[in-house]
Interface confidence: low
Protein backbone atom coordinates (compact mmCIF):
# COMPACT_ATOMS: atom_id res chain seq x y z
CA UNK A 1 0.00 0.00 0.00
CA UNK A 2 0.95 3.64 -0.40
CA UNK A 3 -0.39 6.85 1.05
CA UNK A 4 0.36 10.33 -0.34
CA UNK A 5 0.21 13.82 1.15
CA UNK A 6 0.28 17.14 -0.65
CA UNK A 7 3.36 18.66 1.03
CA UNK A 8 5.35 15.60 1.97
CA UNK A 9 4.82 13.18 -0.90
CA UNK A 10 4.16 9.44 -0.77
CA UNK A 11 4.93 6.76 1.82
CA UNK A 12 4.73 3.04 1.05
CA UNK A 13 4.84 -0.07 3.19
CA UNK A 14 7.01 -1.88 0.63
CA UNK A 15 10.44 -3.29 1.45
CA UNK A 16 12.66 -2.06 3.05
CA UNK A 17 10.20 0.07 5.04
CA UNK A 18 8.21 -3.04 5.96
CA UNK A 19 8.22 -6.72 5.15
CA UNK A 20 11.86 -7.34 6.06
CA UNK A 21 13.22 -9.46 8.91
CA UNK A 22 13.73 -6.48 11.22
CA UNK A 23 10.23 -5.10 10.53
CA UNK A 24 7.97 -7.90 9.29
CA UNK A 25 4.64 -6.08 9.79
CA UNK A 26 3.32 -4.00 6.90
CA UNK A 27 2.54 -0.70 8.59
CA UNK A 28 2.16 2.79 7.14
CA UNK A 29 3.03 5.94 9.06
CA UNK A 30 0.19 8.02 10.43
CA UNK A 31 -0.87 11.16 8.60
CA UNK A 32 1.02 14.43 9.12
CA UNK A 33 -2.10 15.78 10.85
CA UNK A 34 -2.05 12.95 13.40
CA UNK A 35 1.71 13.01 14.00
CA UNK A 36 1.32 16.79 14.39
CA UNK A 37 4.98 17.77 14.07
CA UNK A 38 5.59 21.16 15.73
CA UNK A 39 8.65 23.40 15.63
CA UNK A 40 9.45 25.17 18.90
CA UNK A 41 12.02 27.93 18.39
CA UNK A 42 14.32 29.08 21.16
CA UNK A 43 16.99 31.71 20.46
CA UNK A 44 19.46 33.80 22.45
CA UNK A 45 16.69 36.44 22.54
CA UNK A 46 14.05 34.02 23.89
CA UNK A 47 16.00 31.35 25.79
CA UNK A 48 13.19 30.43 28.19
CA UNK A 49 9.98 30.54 26.18
CA UNK A 50 9.64 29.03 22.73
CA UNK A 51 8.00 30.60 19.71
CA UNK A 52 6.08 28.03 17.68
CA UNK A 53 7.09 28.46 14.03
CA UNK A 54 6.12 26.86 10.77
CA UNK A 55 7.55 26.55 7.25
CA UNK A 56 5.91 29.81 6.29
CA UNK A 57 7.50 33.19 5.46
CA UNK A 58 5.35 35.26 7.80
CA UNK A 59 5.86 32.78 10.65
CA UNK A 60 9.66 32.87 10.30
CA UNK A 61 9.82 36.63 9.71
CA UNK A 62 7.64 37.26 12.75
CA UNK A 63 9.88 35.18 14.99
CA UNK A 64 13.39 35.60 16.41
CA UNK A 65 14.79 33.25 13.74
CA UNK A 66 17.91 34.83 12.23
CA UNK A 67 19.27 33.70 8.88
CA UNK A 68 22.85 34.67 9.76
CA UNK A 69 22.98 31.98 12.46
CA UNK A 70 23.30 28.24 12.45
CA UNK A 71 20.11 26.30 13.08
CA UNK A 72 20.09 23.26 15.31
CA UNK A 73 17.00 21.04 15.34
CA UNK A 74 16.52 18.69 18.30
CA UNK A 75 14.23 15.70 17.79
CA UNK A 76 13.03 13.59 20.72
CA UNK A 77 12.32 9.87 20.67
CA UNK A 78 9.71 7.28 21.59
CA UNK A 79 7.05 8.37 24.16
CA UNK A 80 8.89 11.68 24.62
CA UNK A 81 7.73 15.20 23.71
CA UNK A 82 9.31 18.40 22.39
CA UNK A 83 8.46 20.39 25.51
CA UNK A 84 10.46 18.02 27.73
CA UNK A 85 13.12 19.84 29.79
CA UNK A 86 16.11 18.10 28.23
CA UNK A 87 15.57 19.64 24.79
CA UNK A 88 15.33 23.18 26.19
CA UNK A 89 18.41 22.47 28.34
CA UNK A 90 20.42 21.65 25.21
CA UNK A 91 19.31 24.99 23.77
CA UNK A 92 20.17 26.88 26.96
CA UNK A 93 23.69 25.48 26.99
CA UNK A 94 24.07 26.33 23.30
CA UNK A 95 23.24 29.95 24.10
CA UNK A 96 26.19 30.02 26.50
CA UNK A 97 28.62 29.35 23.66
CA UNK A 98 27.03 30.63 20.44
CA UNK A 99 24.24 32.56 18.78
CA UNK A 100 21.91 30.01 17.26
CA UNK A 101 18.39 29.17 16.16
CA UNK A 102 17.52 26.20 18.37
CA UNK A 103 14.39 24.38 17.23
CA UNK A 104 12.90 21.64 19.39
CA UNK A 105 10.83 19.34 17.22
CA UNK A 106 7.73 18.00 18.96
CA UNK A 107 6.04 14.91 17.52
CA UNK A 108 4.35 13.52 20.61
CA UNK A 109 1.25 12.96 18.48
CA UNK A 110 3.21 10.19 16.77
CA UNK A 111 5.60 9.07 19.53
CA UNK A 112 3.01 8.12 22.16
CA UNK A 113 1.81 4.92 20.58
CA UNK A 114 3.13 1.39 20.10
CA UNK A 115 6.83 1.26 19.28
CA UNK A 116 6.38 -0.36 15.86
CA UNK A 117 3.95 2.37 14.78
CA UNK A 118 6.16 5.11 16.21
CA UNK A 119 9.12 3.71 14.26
CA UNK A 120 7.09 4.30 11.08
CA UNK A 121 5.87 7.73 12.17
CA UNK A 122 9.41 9.07 12.21
CA UNK A 123 9.25 9.02 8.41
CA UNK A 124 6.66 11.80 8.64
CA UNK A 125 8.80 13.69 11.18
CA UNK A 126 11.85 13.42 8.93
CA UNK A 127 9.81 14.60 5.96
CA UNK A 128 8.52 17.58 7.96
CA UNK A 129 12.04 18.60 9.01
CA UNK A 130 13.26 18.20 5.42
CA UNK A 131 10.35 20.34 4.20
CA UNK A 132 11.27 23.00 6.76
CA UNK A 133 14.95 22.97 5.71
CA UNK A 134 14.04 23.17 2.02
CA UNK A 135 11.60 25.99 2.77
CA UNK A 136 14.34 27.97 4.55
CA UNK A 137 16.56 27.48 1.51
CA UNK A 138 13.95 28.53 -1.06
CA UNK A 139 12.42 31.40 0.91
CA UNK A 140 15.51 32.88 2.56
CA UNK A 141 18.46 31.41 0.67
CA UNK A 142 19.43 29.65 3.88
CA UNK A 143 22.05 26.97 3.22
CA UNK A 144 21.30 23.44 4.50
CA UNK A 145 25.00 23.21 5.38
CA UNK A 146 24.21 25.60 8.25
CA UNK A 147 21.70 23.11 9.64
CA UNK A 148 22.52 20.62 12.37
CA UNK A 149 19.91 18.03 13.33
CA UNK A 150 20.28 16.34 16.72
CA UNK A 151 18.07 13.32 17.28
CA UNK A 152 17.64 11.06 20.29
CA UNK A 153 16.54 7.42 19.95
CA UNK A 154 13.86 7.25 17.23
CA UNK A 155 14.59 10.94 16.67
CA UNK A 156 18.05 10.01 15.40
CA UNK A 157 16.47 8.03 12.57
CA UNK A 158 13.99 10.86 11.94
CA UNK A 159 17.07 13.06 11.51
CA UNK A 160 18.47 10.51 9.09
CA UNK A 161 15.25 10.57 7.08
CA UNK A 162 15.39 14.38 6.96
CA UNK A 163 18.96 14.12 5.71
CA UNK A 164 18.12 11.51 3.10
CA UNK A 165 15.27 13.64 1.78
CA UNK A 166 17.57 16.67 1.46
CA UNK A 167 20.11 14.53 -0.42
CA UNK A 168 22.79 14.69 2.25
CA UNK A 169 23.12 18.49 2.03
CA UNK A 170 22.47 19.07 5.73
CA UNK A 171 25.69 20.11 7.44
CA UNK A 172 25.55 17.72 10.36
CA UNK A 173 23.45 15.09 12.06
CA UNK A 174 24.13 13.94 15.61
CA UNK A 175 22.56 10.64 16.65
CA UNK A 176 22.06 10.33 20.39
CA UNK A 177 21.78 6.60 21.05
CA UNK A 178 19.85 5.82 17.85
CA UNK A 179 17.06 3.33 18.48
CA UNK A 180 17.87 -0.34 17.88
CA UNK A 181 14.54 -2.19 17.39
CA UNK A 182 13.35 -2.04 13.77
CA UNK A 183 16.59 -0.28 12.72
CA UNK A 184 19.69 -2.28 13.63
CA UNK A 185 20.83 -4.27 10.61
CA UNK A 186 18.37 -2.61 8.24
CA UNK A 187 19.32 -1.06 4.87
CA UNK A 188 20.75 2.48 5.02
CA UNK A 189 17.61 3.86 3.41
CA UNK A 190 15.61 3.08 6.55
CA UNK A 191 18.00 4.21 9.28
CA UNK A 192 20.52 6.89 10.11
CA UNK A 193 23.69 6.44 8.04
CA UNK A 194 26.72 8.54 7.05
CA UNK A 195 25.25 9.59 3.71
CA UNK A 196 22.43 11.47 5.44
CA UNK A 197 24.55 14.58 6.09
CA UNK A 198 27.94 16.00 5.31
CA UNK A 199 28.99 14.88 8.78
CA UNK A 200 27.28 12.32 11.03
CA UNK A 201 28.42 11.75 14.62
CA UNK A 202 26.84 9.27 17.02
CA UNK A 203 26.89 8.61 20.77
CA UNK A 204 26.06 5.04 21.84
CA UNK A 205 25.02 4.57 25.47
CA UNK A 206 22.60 1.63 25.59
CA UNK A 207 23.98 -0.89 23.15
CA UNK A 208 23.02 -4.11 24.96
CA UNK A 209 20.68 -6.32 22.91
CA UNK A 210 16.99 -5.43 23.21
CA UNK A 211 16.35 -9.10 24.05
CA UNK A 212 16.96 -10.00 26.81
CA UNK A 213 18.73 -6.90 28.17
CA UNK A 214 16.24 -4.20 27.14
CA UNK A 215 18.99 -2.15 25.54
CA UNK A 216 17.14 0.42 23.44
CA UNK A 217 20.15 1.75 21.51
CA UNK A 218 22.12 0.49 18.52
CA UNK A 219 25.53 -1.08 18.90
CA UNK A 220 26.03 -0.85 15.12
CA UNK A 221 28.21 2.01 13.82
CA UNK A 222 26.07 4.35 11.74
CA UNK A 223 28.08 7.59 11.44
CA UNK A 224 31.42 9.00 10.39
CA UNK A 225 32.40 9.11 14.06
CA UNK A 226 30.81 6.68 16.54
CA UNK A 227 31.53 7.22 20.22
CA UNK A 228 31.15 4.50 22.83
CA UNK A 229 31.41 6.22 26.23
CA UNK A 230 32.06 3.74 29.03
CA UNK A 231 31.92 1.00 26.39
CA UNK A 232 28.49 2.06 25.12
CA UNK A 233 26.47 -0.50 27.09
CA UNK A 234 26.27 0.24 30.82
CA UNK A 235 26.65 3.83 31.98
CA UNK A 236 28.09 4.72 35.39
CA UNK A 237 25.42 6.01 37.77
CA UNK A 238 22.68 3.91 36.17
CA UNK A 239 22.83 0.98 38.60
CA UNK A 240 21.50 2.86 41.62
CA UNK A 241 18.80 1.36 43.82
CA UNK A 242 15.22 2.15 42.77
CA UNK A 243 14.58 4.80 45.43
CA UNK A 244 17.73 6.84 44.84
CA UNK A 245 17.19 6.51 41.09
CA UNK A 246 13.66 7.91 41.24
CA UNK A 247 14.37 10.60 43.84
CA UNK A 248 16.82 12.19 41.44
CA UNK A 249 18.72 15.45 41.82
CA UNK A 250 16.78 16.72 38.81
CA UNK A 251 13.41 15.80 40.31
CA UNK A 252 11.00 12.89 40.56
CA UNK A 253 9.98 12.95 36.88
CA UNK A 254 13.55 12.91 35.56
CA UNK A 255 14.35 10.21 38.13
CA UNK A 256 11.43 8.10 36.95
CA UNK A 257 12.57 8.48 33.34
CA UNK A 258 16.08 7.42 34.42
CA UNK A 259 14.70 4.38 36.21
CA UNK A 260 12.97 3.29 33.01
CA UNK A 261 15.80 4.02 30.58
CA UNK A 262 18.85 5.46 32.33
CA UNK A 263 21.51 4.28 29.88
CA UNK A 264 19.43 5.36 26.89
CA UNK A 265 18.91 8.89 28.26
CA UNK A 266 22.56 9.36 29.18
CA UNK A 267 23.37 10.17 25.53
CA UNK A 268 21.56 13.52 25.60
CA UNK A 269 22.95 14.32 29.04
CA UNK A 270 26.49 13.80 27.76
CA UNK A 271 25.75 15.99 24.75
CA UNK A 272 24.32 18.73 26.97
CA UNK A 273 27.42 18.75 29.18
CA UNK A 274 29.77 18.61 26.21
CA UNK A 275 28.56 22.01 25.00
CA UNK A 276 30.12 23.78 27.99
CA UNK A 277 33.17 21.48 28.23
CA UNK A 278 35.00 21.89 24.90
CA UNK A 279 37.73 19.42 25.85
CA UNK A 280 36.05 17.24 28.47
CA UNK A 281 34.95 14.33 26.29
CA UNK A 282 38.02 13.32 24.27
CA UNK A 283 37.35 10.07 22.42
CA UNK A 284 40.29 7.74 21.85
CA UNK A 285 40.56 5.63 18.69
CA UNK A 286 40.84 2.07 19.88
CA UNK A 287 40.11 -1.50 18.84
CA UNK A 288 37.60 -2.03 21.65
CA UNK A 289 36.59 -0.77 25.07
CA UNK A 290 38.49 -3.67 26.68
CA UNK A 291 41.66 -2.51 24.97
CA UNK A 292 40.94 1.06 26.07
CA UNK A 293 40.48 0.06 29.72
CA UNK A 294 43.72 -1.92 29.50
CA UNK A 295 45.43 1.46 28.95
CA UNK A 296 46.54 0.65 25.39
CA UNK A 297 45.06 3.67 23.58
CA UNK A 298 46.67 6.68 25.25
CA UNK A 299 47.59 9.38 24.37
CA UNK A 300 45.73 10.70 21.34
CA UNK A 301 47.42 9.96 17.99
CA UNK A 302 49.17 12.72 16.04
CA UNK A 303 45.89 13.58 14.32
CA UNK A 304 44.35 14.27 17.70
CA UNK A 305 41.22 12.92 19.36
CA UNK A 306 37.72 14.06 18.48
CA UNK A 307 35.52 15.41 21.22
CA UNK A 308 32.34 13.42 21.78
CA UNK A 309 29.30 15.63 21.53
CA UNK A 310 28.96 19.22 20.47
CA UNK A 311 32.54 19.81 19.33
CA UNK A 312 32.94 16.59 17.33
CA UNK A 313 32.84 18.68 14.15
CA UNK A 314 36.19 20.26 15.03
CA UNK A 315 38.04 16.99 14.45
CA UNK A 316 40.15 17.42 11.30
CA UNK A 317 39.69 13.77 10.29
CA UNK A 318 35.96 13.80 10.88
CA UNK A 319 34.95 12.68 7.39
CA UNK A 320 38.11 10.79 6.42
CA UNK A 321 36.18 7.56 6.82
CA UNK A 322 32.87 6.18 8.05
CA UNK A 323 32.45 4.05 11.16
CA UNK A 324 35.43 5.49 13.04
CA UNK A 325 35.11 4.18 16.61
CA UNK A 326 36.16 6.09 19.72
CA UNK A 327 36.13 5.21 23.41
CA UNK A 328 36.19 7.26 26.58
CA UNK A 329 35.02 7.28 30.17
CA UNK A 330 32.62 9.77 31.72
CA UNK A 331 31.51 10.66 35.20
CA UNK A 332 28.53 9.04 36.89
CA UNK A 333 26.54 12.26 37.29
CA UNK A 334 26.57 15.73 35.81
CA UNK A 335 29.11 17.22 35.22
CA UNK A 336 29.95 14.15 33.13
CA UNK A 337 33.16 15.58 31.61
CA UNK A 338 36.46 13.86 32.38
CA UNK A 339 40.10 14.52 31.58
CA UNK A 340 42.35 11.48 31.16
CA UNK A 341 45.93 11.41 32.43
CA UNK A 342 48.68 8.82 32.41
CA UNK A 343 50.90 8.83 35.49
CA UNK A 344 54.16 6.89 35.77
CA UNK A 345 55.78 6.64 39.19
CA UNK A 346 59.39 5.54 39.78
CA UNK A 347 59.78 4.44 43.39
CA UNK A 348 62.57 4.90 45.90
CA UNK A 349 63.11 3.84 49.51
CA UNK A 350 62.29 0.47 51.03
CA UNK A 351 60.65 -2.59 49.52
CA UNK A 352 57.16 -2.95 50.99
CA UNK A 353 53.71 -4.26 50.07
CA UNK A 354 51.15 -1.54 49.67
CA UNK A 355 49.53 0.88 47.26
CA UNK A 356 50.44 4.31 45.93
CA UNK A 357 48.24 7.27 45.04
CA UNK A 358 48.96 10.51 43.24
CA UNK A 359 47.11 13.83 43.00
CA UNK A 360 47.76 16.49 40.37
CA UNK A 361 48.05 20.25 40.81
CA UNK A 362 47.93 22.58 37.83
CA UNK A 363 47.20 26.12 36.74
CA UNK A 364 43.52 25.35 36.17
CA UNK A 365 42.79 23.19 39.20
CA UNK A 366 43.68 20.24 41.38
CA UNK A 367 42.64 16.60 41.09
CA UNK A 368 41.63 14.07 43.69
CA UNK A 369 43.98 11.25 44.67
CA UNK A 370 44.06 8.36 42.19
CA UNK A 371 45.53 4.92 42.77
CA UNK A 372 48.46 4.16 40.48
CA UNK A 373 49.51 0.72 41.69
CA UNK A 374 48.80 -1.90 44.34
CA UNK A 375 51.27 -4.67 45.18
CA UNK A 376 54.97 -4.97 45.93
CA UNK A 377 56.59 -1.52 45.97
CA UNK A 378 60.21 -1.99 44.95
CA UNK A 379 62.77 0.82 44.73
CA UNK A 380 63.65 1.82 41.13
CA UNK A 381 60.55 0.07 39.76
CA UNK A 382 58.17 2.15 37.65
CA UNK A 383 54.40 1.77 37.73
CA UNK A 384 51.97 3.42 35.34
CA UNK A 385 48.24 3.90 35.28
CA UNK A 386 45.66 6.01 33.49
CA UNK A 387 42.76 7.70 35.21
CA UNK A 388 39.93 10.06 34.40
CA UNK A 389 39.93 13.22 36.47
CA UNK A 390 36.79 15.27 37.04
CA UNK A 391 39.03 18.34 36.90
CA UNK A 392 41.05 19.69 34.00
CA UNK A 393 44.16 20.67 35.93
CA UNK A 394 45.73 22.49 32.98
CA UNK A 395 49.50 22.78 32.90
CA UNK A 396 50.92 20.68 35.73
CA UNK A 397 52.78 22.57 38.45
CA UNK A 398 53.32 19.89 41.08
CA UNK A 399 52.14 16.44 42.12
CA UNK A 400 51.61 14.86 45.51
CA UNK A 401 52.43 11.24 46.29
CA UNK A 402 51.18 9.13 49.17
CA UNK A 403 51.49 5.45 49.98
CA UNK A 404 49.74 3.00 52.30
CA UNK A 405 50.98 -0.25 53.77
CA UNK A 406 48.87 -3.35 53.18
CA UNK A 407 50.23 -4.95 56.35
CA UNK A 408 51.32 -3.52 59.69
CA UNK A 409 55.06 -2.94 59.57
CA UNK A 410 56.70 -2.06 62.93
CA UNK A 411 59.92 -0.92 61.20
CA UNK A 412 58.13 2.22 59.89
CA UNK A 413 59.61 1.95 56.38
CA UNK A 414 59.97 4.99 54.15
CA UNK A 415 59.00 5.05 50.48
CA UNK A 416 59.33 7.85 47.94
CA UNK A 417 58.84 8.70 44.32
CA UNK A 418 62.11 9.70 42.74
CA UNK A 419 60.29 10.66 39.54
CA UNK A 420 56.69 11.04 38.42
CA UNK A 421 55.80 11.63 34.78
CA UNK A 422 52.33 12.95 33.99
CA UNK A 423 51.11 12.78 30.41
CA UNK A 424 48.01 14.57 29.12
CA UNK A 425 45.79 13.13 26.41
CA UNK A 426 47.49 15.29 23.77
CA UNK A 427 50.84 13.70 24.66
CA UNK A 428 52.25 16.61 26.63
CA UNK A 429 54.54 15.38 29.41
CA UNK A 430 55.38 16.94 32.76
CA UNK A 431 58.25 15.57 34.86
CA UNK A 432 58.44 15.87 38.64
CA UNK A 433 61.20 14.74 41.00
CA UNK A 434 61.98 14.42 44.70
CA UNK A 435 64.94 12.93 46.59
CA UNK A 436 62.79 12.46 49.70
CA UNK A 437 61.09 9.40 51.16
CA UNK A 438 58.12 9.42 53.54
CA UNK A 439 56.45 7.14 56.02
CA UNK A 440 53.06 5.72 55.07
CA UNK A 441 50.10 8.13 54.95
CA UNK A 442 52.43 11.13 54.66
CA UNK A 443 52.12 13.35 51.57
CA UNK A 444 55.25 13.86 49.49
CA UNK A 445 55.26 16.91 47.21
CA UNK A 446 57.19 16.61 43.94
CA UNK A 447 58.19 19.69 41.97
CA UNK A 448 59.35 19.97 38.35
CA UNK A 449 62.68 18.21 37.79
Amino acid sequence: KEVCYERLGCFSDDSPWSGITERPLHILPWSPKDVNTRFLLYTNENPNNFQEVAADSSSISGSNFKTNRKTRFIIHGFIDKGEENWLANVCKNLFKVESVNCICVDWKGGSRTGYTQASQNIRIVGAEVAYFVEFLQSAFGYSPSNVHVIGHSLGAHAAGEAGRRTNGTIGRITGLDPAEPCFQGTPELVRLDPSDAKFVDVIHTDGAPIVPNLGFGMSQVVGHLDFFPNGGVEMPGCKKNILSQIVDIDGIWEGTRDFAACNHLRSYKYYTDSIVNPDGFAGFPCASYNVFTANKCFPCPSGGCPQMGHYADRYPGKTNDVGQKFYLDTGDASNFARWRYKVSVTLSGKKVTGHILVSLFGNKGNSKQYEIFKGTLKPDSTHSNEFDSDVDVGDLQMVKFIWYNNVINPTLPRVGASKIIVETNVGKQFNFCSPETVREEVLLTLTPC
Epitope: K96, G394, V426
Partner: nanobody, 121 residues
Framework: QVQLQESGGGLVQAGGSLRLSCAAS????????MGWYRQTPGTERDVVAT???????NYADSVKGRFTISRDNILNTVYLQMNSLKPEDTAVYHC???????????????WGQGTLVTVSS
Protein backbone atom coordinates in the same frame (compact mmCIF):
# COMPACT_ATOMS: atom_id res chain seq x y z
CA GLN B 1 33.78 41.90 26.17
CA VAL B 2 36.23 39.42 24.61
CA GLN B 3 36.69 39.45 20.84
CA LEU B 4 38.88 38.09 18.06
CA GLN B 5 40.42 40.21 15.33
CA GLU B 6 42.02 38.70 12.22
CA SER B 7 44.53 40.31 9.90
CA GLY B 8 46.88 39.35 7.09
CA GLY B 9 44.51 38.34 4.32
CA GLY B 10 44.86 39.58 0.77
CA LEU B 11 45.59 38.71 -2.84
CA VAL B 12 48.53 36.46 -3.64
CA GLN B 13 49.69 34.48 -6.64
CA ALA B 14 49.64 30.69 -6.68
CA GLY B 15 52.77 29.35 -5.03
CA GLY B 16 53.07 32.42 -2.83
CA SER B 17 52.81 32.81 0.93
CA LEU B 18 50.68 34.69 3.45
CA ARG B 19 50.69 34.90 7.22
CA LEU B 20 47.39 35.35 9.02
CA SER B 21 47.18 36.64 12.58
CA CYS B 22 44.32 36.58 15.04
CA ALA B 23 44.49 38.36 18.38
CA ALA B 24 42.09 37.83 21.27
CA SER B 25 41.44 40.96 23.28
CA UNK B 26 39.42 41.84 26.35
CA UNK B 27 39.24 40.40 29.84
CA UNK B 28 40.69 36.91 29.25
CA UNK B 29 41.20 34.28 31.91
CA UNK B 30 42.57 31.58 29.65
CA UNK B 31 42.32 30.29 26.10
CA UNK B 32 42.08 26.61 25.29
CA UNK B 33 41.91 25.63 21.62
CA MET B 34 42.60 28.24 18.93
CA GLY B 35 42.16 27.54 15.26
CA TRP B 36 41.53 28.63 11.72
CA TYR B 37 38.51 27.67 9.64
CA ARG B 38 37.69 28.64 6.08
CA GLN B 39 34.51 29.07 4.13
CA THR B 40 33.66 29.56 0.48
CA PRO B 41 30.25 30.76 -0.69
CA GLY B 42 27.54 28.14 -0.32
CA THR B 43 29.66 25.73 1.71
CA GLU B 44 30.04 24.98 5.39
CA ARG B 45 32.90 26.39 7.42
CA ASP B 46 35.70 23.80 7.39
CA VAL B 47 38.53 23.37 9.84
CA VAL B 48 41.99 24.26 8.48
CA ALA B 49 44.15 23.87 11.58
CA THR B 50 43.82 23.95 15.36
CA UNK B 51 46.28 24.31 18.20
CA UNK B 52 45.64 23.52 21.86
CA UNK B 53 47.04 25.44 24.79
CA UNK B 54 49.64 22.70 25.27
CA UNK B 55 50.86 23.21 21.70
CA UNK B 56 49.31 20.12 20.11
CA UNK B 57 48.33 20.83 16.49
CA ASN B 58 45.89 19.34 14.00
CA TYR B 59 45.69 20.04 10.26
CA ALA B 60 43.19 19.30 7.53
CA ASP B 61 44.66 16.82 5.03
CA SER B 62 44.47 19.40 2.23
CA VAL B 63 46.92 21.78 3.96
CA LYS B 64 49.35 19.39 5.65
CA GLY B 65 52.94 20.26 4.84
CA ARG B 66 51.98 23.69 3.46
CA PHE B 67 50.36 25.48 6.39
CA THR B 68 51.73 25.92 9.89
CA ILE B 69 49.70 27.03 12.89
CA SER B 70 51.36 28.56 15.92
CA ARG B 71 50.34 30.65 18.89
CA ASP B 72 51.72 33.11 21.38
CA ASN B 73 50.11 32.49 24.76
CA ILE B 74 51.42 35.78 26.14
CA LEU B 75 49.90 37.87 23.36
CA ASN B 76 46.82 35.60 23.08
CA THR B 77 47.45 35.41 19.35
CA VAL B 78 47.28 32.57 16.85
CA TYR B 79 49.08 32.60 13.50
CA LEU B 80 48.64 30.67 10.28
CA GLN B 81 51.64 30.59 7.97
CA MET B 82 50.40 29.59 4.53
CA ASN B 83 53.00 28.52 1.96
CA SER B 84 52.68 27.08 -1.56
CA LEU B 85 49.21 28.56 -1.84
CA LYS B 86 46.83 27.15 -4.44
CA PRO B 87 43.75 28.69 -6.09
CA GLU B 88 41.58 26.24 -4.15
CA ASP B 89 42.81 27.86 -0.91
CA THR B 90 40.77 30.94 -1.82
CA ALA B 91 38.24 31.48 0.98
CA VAL B 92 37.28 33.65 3.91
CA TYR B 93 39.47 32.51 6.82
CA HIS B 94 37.88 32.69 10.24
CA CYS B 95 39.71 32.58 13.53
CA UNK B 96 38.15 30.51 16.34
CA UNK B 97 39.00 30.23 20.02
CA UNK B 98 37.63 28.72 23.21
CA UNK B 99 38.06 31.59 25.65
CA UNK B 100 37.36 31.62 29.35
CA UNK B 101 36.76 35.24 30.37
CA UNK B 102 38.50 36.43 33.54
CA UNK B 103 36.76 35.33 36.75
CA UNK B 104 34.34 32.97 35.01
CA UNK B 105 34.31 29.17 34.91
CA UNK B 106 32.96 28.59 31.41
CA UNK B 107 34.71 28.62 28.06
CA UNK B 108 32.98 30.58 25.29
CA UNK B 109 33.39 29.73 21.63
CA UNK B 110 34.37 32.92 19.79
CA TRP B 111 34.66 33.59 16.06
CA GLY B 112 36.43 36.36 14.20
CA GLN B 113 34.72 38.28 11.40
CA GLY B 114 36.96 36.63 8.83
CA THR B 115 39.69 37.75 6.45
CA LEU B 116 39.59 37.10 2.72
CA VAL B 117 42.44 35.19 1.10
CA THR B 118 42.44 35.20 -2.70
CA VAL B 119 44.93 33.03 -4.60
CA SER B 120 45.15 33.86 -8.30
CA SER B 121 46.45 31.45 -10.88
Amino acid sequence: QVQLQESGGGLVQAGGSLRLSCAASGSIGSIHTMGWYRQTPGTERDVVATIQDGGSTNYADSVKGRFTISRDNILNTVYLQMNSLKPEDTAVYHCNADVRPYRTSRYLELWGQGTLVTVSS
